[in-house]
């Protein structure tokens, strides 16, 4: 099975205990580690931060102790904007420009493959960004030579079912894919304005259309219907949680929300905890499970956070493992307990390393 | 600036062995395959063996298949091509090349060369 | 493994352009990048174009890469010839296991 981990960049800014560079990572617990994000300037595969260059470095030499690990450099993300990565796939000259930077980029930082992070093409960009894919590993099949192995090509896919319809075409972009992320969590938000987790394994009793799709099990049988082959797809599990604010003394699923969770230490987002802030934040806590959907939920105060434990992930590890997927992914391990300070468990990565165990075990 | 300096090459007896070395420095060595390419006097190029960026894979030309093995050590930043039962039809000139990340030799050794005569 | 045939040699005057060609005796030409190589006499190779049709920085724009499918061939052309450009051109190809050079064309400048 595959373990796609991801990490990133922005995380070296965290505070103290919070940052976290590519040499704190365990270069045996991953099969793939996926540097996010690079940028595109000037129709050209670019660094984002100051010292990516640095860090690049960094992250691949982990391979020289393990030759088996591979590494992606992620392309794109929520900050670089789907507008700009629309008009590069839109016009033929930028997509070429584009396609040919990529190849010596990687080669020369010593990655092993790009993926595509394109959050999200809009309707009119479903047929550009197939169009992307397919021009893209034409190209990683003429450059790879003798002592060059194929560049690998993957992308990280929404898991929700409005955004699959409008911005891919399933079985025509898996073609052309290594694999796919499907990116299964953040399916509830504080737009709903109730309290729910955000990385369900199965549908909620309660749930109505739309949230009937707001689930993994959904998302990943919805993906397969679609073309897209089990063996290619790699499910995505969070190493973080979302949080809410309750607006009444009401504290279980569904629950109203003033709004997003108060911001977290180290992480400083509203609304995200880290894995190794829920487990600061689990301390004087009340634990919860949500039986039908898999995982588990605390509050403490005023504070609600669905997230996912070593339990959550073993479950769905033995999901992925039941429906034949070719394995899991991980966003992020510098979210997850990468010192192995915070749980108490004196072990580093400790959801990561629950999902290696769980791929592992026959 | 990538410099490849290759070492190693002389005169010697048909079925002799030699080791020919290229030591490689500007640039991160471990990220690029290398490559060992030849040419007989007054004749063409010939591409003789290539070795992966972790040394993982190699692959030889049919004519040198099963004498000659190409090696790396990527913490001397140095690439190795072993030539056993050495011909008279291995005399050539040998380049040490750098598997570019654009052209796909895009540094090349200043060449070493070996004859092969009894 | 395949082949690349190339012209043993051509020649013209400073000034005029010269073609060369490299055709490959089996597979498709378009299935694998083309370069090609500058050697001038007692020198090291150095690359005039890669992948095709693309110029190392420092490559005069007189040089110039084409392929062409239906003579399953592909091209280097010498504009404005130059006295500096006398040489011998080799183009190379591979496959997932080889790398192959062309035979080699002595470009000779006249006068």
């Known amino acids: 099975y595959k373990l796609v981990c991801y990490y990133t960049s922005w995380s070296q800014y965290r505070e103290g205990d919070g940052s976290c560079f590519p040499d704190a990572l365990d270069r045996f617990l991953c099969t793939h580690i996926i540097y996010s994000f690079a940028n595109i300037s000037n129709d050209h595969i670019d660094t984002w931060e100051w010292n990516d260059v640095t860090l690049y470095g960094m992250l691949n030499t982990l391979k020289n102790r393990n030759p088996n690990l591979k590494t992606l450099l992620s392309v794109g993300g929520w900050n670089f904007g789907s507008q700009r990565f629309s008009k590069i796939a839109s016009n033929t000259q930028s997509r070429r420009t584009f396609i040919k930077s990529v190849p010596p980029f990687l080669r020369t930082h010593g990655f092993d493959g790009l993926d595509l992070a394109w959050l999200y093409p809009g309707r009119r960009d479903k047929q550009h960004f197939t169009t992307l894919i397919k021009e893209m590993k034409a190209e990683f099949i003429k450059e790879a030579q003798p002592g060059k192995k194929q560049l690998l090509l993957s992308a990280a896919l929404s898991a929700g079912k409005v955004t699959i319809d409008s911005s891919y075409d399933i079985a025509k972009i898996s073609q052309h894919l290594d694999f796919i992320s499907i990116m299964t969590y953040d399916f509830h938000g504080a737009w709903r304005g109730t309290t729910g987790h955000h990385s369900p394994l199965f549908r909620g009793q309660e749930d109505a259309s739309p949230d009937r799709f707001s689930n993994t099990d959904y998302a990943v049988g919805y993906m397969l219907r679609l073309g897209a082959p089990a063996s290619k797809l790699v499910m995505g599990i969070p190493t973080f949680g979302r949080s809410f604010t309750l607006a009444s003394s009401e504290t279980g699923v569904g629950a109203p929300i003033s709004g997003p969770g108060i911001p977290g230490r180290f992480t400083k987002e509203a609304g995200t905890l880290a894995y190794y802030e829920i487990c600061d934040f689990l301390r004087g806590a009340t634990v919860h499970r949500i039986l039908g959907q898999q995982v588990p939920y605390a509050t403490k105060g005023n504070q609600w956070v669905g997230y996912d434990d070593q339990e959550s992930v073993k479950s769905k590890v033995q999901y992925l493992k039941d429906r034949q997927l070719a394995g899991a992914m991980v966003w992020a391990l510098d979210l997850d307990d990468f010192q192995g300070s915070f749980c108490g468990q004196d072990l580093r990565f400790p959801l990561t390393n629950a999902i290696k165990d769980a791929l592992a075990a026959t | 600036e990538v410099q490849l300096l290759e070492s190693g090459g002389g005169l010697l007896q048909p079925g002799g062995s030699l080791r020919l070395s290229c030591a490689a420095s500007?640039?991160?060595?471990?990220?690029?395959?290398m490559t060992w390419v030849r040419q007989a006097p007054g004749k063409g190029l010939e591409w003789v063996s290539t070795?992966?960026?972790?040394?993982?894979?190699?692959f030889y030309a049919d004519s040198v298949k099963g004498h000659f093995t190409i090696s790396r050590d990527n913490s001397k930043d140095t690439v190795y091509l072993q030539m056993n039962s050495l011909r008279a039809e291995d005399t050539a000139v040998y380049y040490c090349?750098?598997?570019?990340?654009?052209?796909?030799?895009?540094?090349w050794g200043q060449g070493s060369p070996v004859t092969v005569s009894s | 493994n395949f082949m690349l045939t190339q012209p043993h040699s051509v020649s013209e005057s400073p000034g005029k352009t010269v073609t060369i060609s490299c055709t490959r005796s089996?597979?498709?030409?378009?299935?694998?990048?083309v370069q090609w190589y500058q050697q001038r006499p007692g020198s090291s190779p150095t690359t005039v174009i890669y992948?095709?049709?693309?110029?190392p920085s420092g490559v005069p724009d007189r040089f110039s890469g084409s392929i062409d499918s239906s003579s399953n061939s592909a091209s280097l052309t010498i504009s404005g010839l130059k006295t500096e450009d006398e040489a011998d051109y080799y183009c190379?190809?591979?496959?997932?296991?080889?790398?192959?050079f062309g035979t080699g064309t002595k470009v000779t400048v006249l006068g």
């Open positions: 070795i992966s960026g972790n040394g993982d894979e190699t």
């Open positions: 190379q190809s591979y496959d997932s296991s080889n790398y192959v």
């Open positions: 992948e095709d049709n693309q110029r």
């Open positions: 090349a750098k598997g570019g990340h654009y052209s796909f030799f895009d540094s």
């Open positions: 089996s597979g498709s030409i378009a299935s694998n990048y």
């Open positions: 500007g640039l991160t060595f471990r990220n690029y395959a």
